[in-house]
């Protein structure tokens, strides 16, 4: 079948890194500079992605694979394939349309990206605040007040898993 297909369509013989050139009687020509074909039988080579501006090249383009970009220092990738670069902020801040802003009281951000998230409400789990929260750090919940009363068992049940929204990203 492969042989039959090849006789019918000479382009099917062109390997990755080449294209079937109609200007040269459908012979397999190498991809032009800064272009690639990742599969065989292609009639054109795709132009390589150019990492420019806040993007920088993470992986160079080859004749068989596209370039990959990441972000220059002070920025981080957003979206699949690093489609955009977003400005970093300091811990304890979030990025708004007006730039980096400190987290409001009662919220924190322990990363250079993302939004400020509310401190954990320890009382919802029947616990007390062991360490106060800051703009950069969540509160630390300690044993419930009942656990600290005299004669109480020192063995406490494991704390429930935190909500997904509070897990480090």
């Amino acid at each position: 079948f492969e042989r039959t297909r090849s006789l019918q369509d000479p382009c099917s013989n062109c390997p990755a890194g080449t294209f079937c050139d109609n200007n040269r009687n459908q012979i397999c020509s190498p991809c032009p500079p800064n272009s690639f074909s990742s599969a065989g039988g292609q009639r054109t080579c795709d132009i390589c992605r150019q990492c420019k501006g806040v993007f920088r090249t993470r992986k160079e383009c080859s004749s068989t694979s596209n370039a990959e970009c990441d972000c220059t220092p002070g920025f981080h990738c957003l979206g699949a394939g690093c489609s955009m670069c977003e400005q970093d902020c300091k811990q304890g801040q979030e990025l708004t349309k007006k730039g980096c802003k400190d987290c409001c009281f009662g919220t924190f951000n322990d990363q250079k990206r993302g939004i400020c998230r509310p401190w954990t409400n320890c009382s919802l789990d029947g616990k007390s605040v062991l360490v106060n929260g800051t703009k950069e750090r969540d509160v630390v919940c300690g044993p419930s007040p009942a656990d600290l009363s005299p004669g109480a068992s020192s063995v406490t049940p494991p704390a429930p898993a935190r909500e997904p929204g509070h897990s480090p990203q």
Epitope: T44, R49, K52, A80, G81, S83, M84
Partner: antibody, heavy 118, light 112 residues
Framework: QVQLQESGPGLVKPSETLSLTCTVS????????WSWIRQPPGKGLEWMGY???????QYNPSLKSRVTISVDTSKNQFSLKLSSVTAADTAVYYC????????????WGQGTLVTVSS | EIVMTQSPLSLPVTPGEPASISCRSS???????????LDWYLQKPGQSPQLLIY???NRASGVPDRFSGSGSGTDFTLKISRVEAEDVGVYYC?????????FGQGTKLEIK
């Protein structure tokens, strides 16, 4: 090989919203950037904006307040909405595959003429 | 935004003769990676534009070798070594360095 096909109404009333869809065939939309470019009758080309398959967008500042581009990877389509249109928005609208996010439009649709008139 | 200016706007050519189109940008298109982010497109009558040249001088696959691009910084040239009847249409340069990408006004090539 990759083919792009624009679809949508050819006539839109002033102050209404122009809506077009581009269907990509012969390849997956789940890579590259996808742009809309327009050309008023007898005039030059104007880039309107792009979308990446993950949903990231960038728009021409001259149109930013009026243009929205969205993507539906399950249908291999991306769409353009242009609000508050006037006669000046009468143009042939092209969708194109954008190799780098604002550069080298290697594959184009055949274009669709949208007339803004009451 | 970067402004692109083409000349001439009209170019009558005899088949078999060479042709040259100039494109100038309001700021340098030479990026730190050593590439000039300039494309050339041809829009044949009643058709969509098609990419001819990218990164200033790279011919897109399938484009005849009579087309060549040259230049750097702010001054660029598209040359056709021997014009054929099928080359008629409007040629556009486009800067791809900054968003928004911007096009020249176009050069209409016609056969004498």
């Amino acid at each position: 090989q990759v083919q792009l096909q624009e679809s949508g109404p050819g006539l839109v009333k002033p102050s209404e919203t122009l809506s077009l869809t581009c269907t990509v065939s012969g390849g997956s939309i789940s890579s590259y950037y996808w742009s809309w470019i327009r050309q008023p009758p007898g005039k030059g080309l104007e880039w309107m904006g792009y979308i990446y398959y993950s949903g990231s967008t960038q728009y021409n500042p001259s149109l930013k307040s009026r243009v929205t581009i969205s993507v539906d990877t399950s249908k291999n389509q991306f769409s353009l909405k242009l609000s508050s249109v006037t006669a000046a928005d009468t143009a042939v609208y092209y969708c194109a595959r954008d190799q780098s996010g604002g550069g080298s439009f290697q594959h184009w649709g055949q274009g669709t003429l949208v007339t803004v008139s009451s | 935004e970067i402004v692109m200016t083409q000349s001439p706007l009209s170019l009558p050519v005899t088949p078999g003769e060479p042709a040259s189109i100039s494109c100038r940008s309001s700021q340098s298109l030479l990026y730190s990676n050593g590439y000039n982010h300039l494309d050339w497109y041809l829009q044949k009558p009643g058709q969509s534009p098609q990419l001819l040249i990218y990164l200033g001088s790279n011919r897109a696959s399938g484009v005849p070798d009579r087309f060549s691009g040259s230049g750097s910084g702010t001054d660029f040239t598209l040359k056709i070594s021997r014009v054929e009847a099928e080359d008629v249409g409007v040629y556009y340069c486009m800067q791809a360095l900054q968003t928004p990408p911007t096009f020249g006004q176009g050069t209409k090539l016609e056969i004498k």
